[in-house]
């Protein structure tokens, strides 16, 4: 028996859905009572679901797991996950045994979008040219950690004086903080970009300076 | 007939090497999973190790997980039992298994194995 | 892993009774479960896989019954080759195989 799975990893989104791929060749005259399938972490080694016996016997892995029953027997032994979470990310090995065993690794990938960004100004009045500001570029939610860049108004990147922080949430969302520092000049953009780097999601946000008033 | 025949056990100082061999007969050997089981003196029967028909998948004990290597050579039928960082506690006789669905259905005369400094 | 205790440790019968050799599992492996004949000296039979299954050639003296988590292997009428030390090993979880500590059946 020889066992295939996706070489790329599987990306899926938090709180949706995922099937992480296994298939066989089953030889002619095969039955499901020959089938012994266990999916497991890769890492820990814990189950995560199993078929044996001609008998799905259910998910180990917080009762969100199911396989495809009416696609076994053609080699289908797929498995899907139900509402994913940040901490399913990682590596399933699917083993597959009908007479002989074979195994194979497929890697899933969590992501979240980032939110649209919001721009605070600190100080955000009476503002002159040569003033230093701090602008705070926040987005929220997402995974895995941000790239995030900052740009002038002509598309200069800045790079100096920028503090970026992100913490994650209880269910492993990171929030993003960049810190720019800056000496206003006589008018100015300044643009943040946050990217997810799995799902190449852009989310920009920017503030305009003028004499007065301020533009977000 | 099916026929298993070890080979390569003898006697070897902790912290040594030591390699067997299994010659396979009798059946089409890239067809079934093989295995490794040991036999401590006077003691039961313990599961080492197993290696797919192909050849792509390996399983291991945990007691000799990242010091033994199963591997297998279809084109002269042989398993091989790579047993590196022996231990006292790997004394045993060493038998090859044909498997079939998990269950061994032939096994070999098995070749001992002695840890002893 | 599956833990499988054998009893009784030793059984002692004269030929032509019934022996009656248990196995319990730590948890269900339905009938995922074989049985082993190892006489002495030699090297370990299958008897019996699929918890009732007879292997090839083993005569019908030998059965096996159970599921789940207790196993029997009965001998129906012990003859003098019938003393051993049997082994049962399950493969329900079959990335970590197991085997039961043995039950030796001596001559009475």
């Known amino acids: 028996v020889e066992v295939q799975v996706s070489e790329d990893p599987v990306v899926a989104l938090v709180d949706t859905d995922a099937t992480l791929r296994c298939s066989f060749s089953p030889e002619p005259g095969f039955s499901l009572a020959q089938l012994n399938l266990i999916w497991q972490l890769t890492d820990t080694k814990q189950l995560v679901h199993s078929f044996t016996e001609g008998r799905d016997q259910g998910s180990a892995y917080s009762n969100r797991t199911a396989l495809f029953p009416d696609l076994l027997v053609q080699g289908n032994a797929s498995l899907r996950l139900q509402r994913v979470r940040v901490t399913d990310e990682g590596s399933y090995t699917c083993f597959v045994s009908i007479q002989d065993f074979d195994s194979a690794a497929v890697s899933l990938q969590v992501a979240a979008p980032y939110s649209k960004p919001s721009m605070t100004l600190e100080p955000n009045k009476d503002l002159r040219p040569g003033n230093m500001v701090t602008i705070t570029c926040s987005s929220y939610q997402g995974y895995p950690e941000a790239e995030v860049f900052w740009k002038d108004g002509q598309g200069v990147p800045l790079t100096g004086n920028v503090t970026t922080s992100q913490m994650a949430n209880e269910r492993g969302l990171f929030d993003v903080h960049s810190v720019l520092r800056v000496v206003l000049g006589a008018n100015g953009t300044y643009s943040c970009l946050v990217r997810n780097p799995v799902l190449q999601q852009d989310a920009h946000g920017s503030v305009t300076i003028t004499g007065q008033p301020l533009t977000f | 007939d099916v026929q298993l025949v070890e080979s390569g056990g003898g006697v070897v100082r902790p912290g040594e090497s030591l390699r067997l061999s299994c010659a396979a007969s009798?059946?089409?050997?890239?067809?079934?999973?093989m295995s490794w089981v040991r036999q401590a003196p006077g003691e039961g029967l313990e599961w080492v190790s197993s290696?797919?028909?192909?050849?792509?998948?390996?399983l291991y004990a945990d007691s000799v997980k990242g010091r033994f290597t199963i591997s297998r050579d279809s084109s002269n039928n042989s398993l091989y039992l790579q047993m590196n960082s022996l231990r006292a506690e790997d004394t045993a006789v060493y038998y090859c298994?044909?498997?079939?669905?998990?269950?061994?259905?032939?096994w070999g005369l098995g070749t001992l194995v002695t840890v002893s400094s | 892993e599956i833990v499988l205790t054998q009893s009784p440790g030793t059984l002692t019968l004269s030929p032509g009774e019934r022996a009656t050799l248990s196995c319990r599992a730590s948890r269900s492996i339905l009938t995922s479960l074989a049985w082993y004949q190892q006489r002495p000296g030699q090297t370990p039979r299958l008897l019996i896989y699929?918890?009732?299954s007879r292997a090839t050639g083993i005569p019908d003296r030998f059965s096996g019954s159970g599921s789940g988590t207790e196993f029997t292997l009965t001998i129906s009428s012990l003859q003098s080759e019938d003393f051993a030390v049997y082994y049962c090993q399950q493969y329900y979880d079959w990335l970590t195989i197991t085997f039961g500590g043995g039950t030796k059946v001596e001559i009475k």
């Open positions: 009798g059946f089409t050997f890239s067809s079934y999973a």
């Open positions: 298994a044909k498997a079939r669905n998990n269950f061994f259905d032939y």
């Open positions: 290696i797919s028909g192909s050849g792509g998948s390996t």
């Open positions: 699929g918890a009732n």
